[in-house]
């Protein structure tokens, strides 16, 4: 009888050891999965945006230094233009320097000629200050020439080589900007 109990106890202990081993394996597997998921996610986020294309900018976007630009082929009001850019993982163009302004106006001349293009600049209704969409102020040389007498909200646009202002509800082309993908080589 005692031998029988002792045998059962040993079997139970063996089962317990096996279960502990299985649990340990499962925990390791889970941790490894979580780690792989993290790597996979990072890899996906990097590779998805380049989608079989190792160039720093998506197709139909223009590159200059660390930025990619998209010149729209449709008209829209300023707020819809911003929405359209966000859907592309970008924002309306934010011009940081005269060099960037020259590049943009030079590119526009080649692509389309003298049209109006919304950029990410708007005038605060209360203070009258011009601000880029990220909240920063434009450099003094990049303030729109006062052209709008609108009582409505006023936004900035590029035409030829000038930065101008207009009622945000008017229809214009627009330019989106996103960061260029850094080459991993």
């Amino acid at each position: 009888k005692l031998l029988q109990v002792s045998t059962i106890a040993m079997q139970q202990q063996e089962k317990l050891i096996q279960q502990e081993r299985a649990l340990l394996n499962f925990t390791e597997w889970k941790r490894s999965c979580a780690l792989q998921m993290k790597y996979c996610q990072a890899f996906m986020q990097n590779s998805l945006s380049s989608a079989h294309n190792s160039s720093p900018c998506p197709n139909n976007w223009i590159q200059n230094r660390e930025s990619c630009y998209y010149v729209s082929e449709i008209w829209s009001i300023w707020h819809t233009s911003q929405e359209n850019c966000l859907k592309e993982g970008s924002t309306l163009l934010q011009i940081e320097s005269k060099e960037e302004m020259d590049f943009i106006t030079g590119s526009l001349r080649k692509i389309k000629g003298s049209y109006d293009y919304w950029v990410g600049l708007s005038q605060d209704g209360h203070s009258g200050r011009w601000l880029w969409q990220d909240g920063s102020s434009p450099s003094p040389g990049l303030l729109p020439a006062e052209r709008s007498q609108s009582a409505n909200q006023v936004c900035g646009y590029v035409k030829s080589n000038s930065l101008l202002s207009s009622n945000c509800s008017t229809w214009k082309y627009f330019i989106c900007e996103k960061y260029a993908l850094r080459s991993s080589v």
Epitope: L86, T91, Y179
Partner: nanobody, 115 residues
């Protein structure tokens, strides 16, 4: 499909602060931008703040300098830190994700700024 779960709304006094958080799940790899919109009764939903997958930010004029949007790509969350709140910030705030040219929305969270 992208699912969004918001948290952090409530009642706050003018001049106070609140932090909204939104967690995304589902097809998170396709998200191009995430952000917050607000909507007052009978009005259109308007952008408050957004952040792209590359980290570019956009804010509504009325919140510039007061609100800050941030994104944690590891946790797939977007947060909106709201400081110096005003009574006119009272609204229902919706988390938004833009993926594959579609808009996905959270259920909305009420923020009331009142003394």
């Amino acid at each position: 499909q992208v699912q969004l779960q918001e948290s952090g709304g409530g009642l706050v006094q003018p001049g106070g602060s609140l932090r909204l958080s939104c967690a995304a799940s589902g097809s998170i790899f396709s998200i191009a931008a995430m952000g917050w919109y607000r909507q007052a009764p009978g009005k259109q939903r308007e952008l408050v703040a957004a952040i792209t997958s590359g980290g570019r930010r956009a804010y509504a004029d009325s919140v510039k300098g007061r609100f800050t949007i941030s994104r944690d790509n590891d946790e797939n969350t977007v947060a909106l830190q709201m400081n110096s709140l005003k009574p006119e910030d009272t609204d229902v705030y919706y988390c938004n994700a833009k993926a594959d040219h579609n808009d996905y929305w959270g259920q909305g969270t009420q923020i009331t700024v009142s003394s």
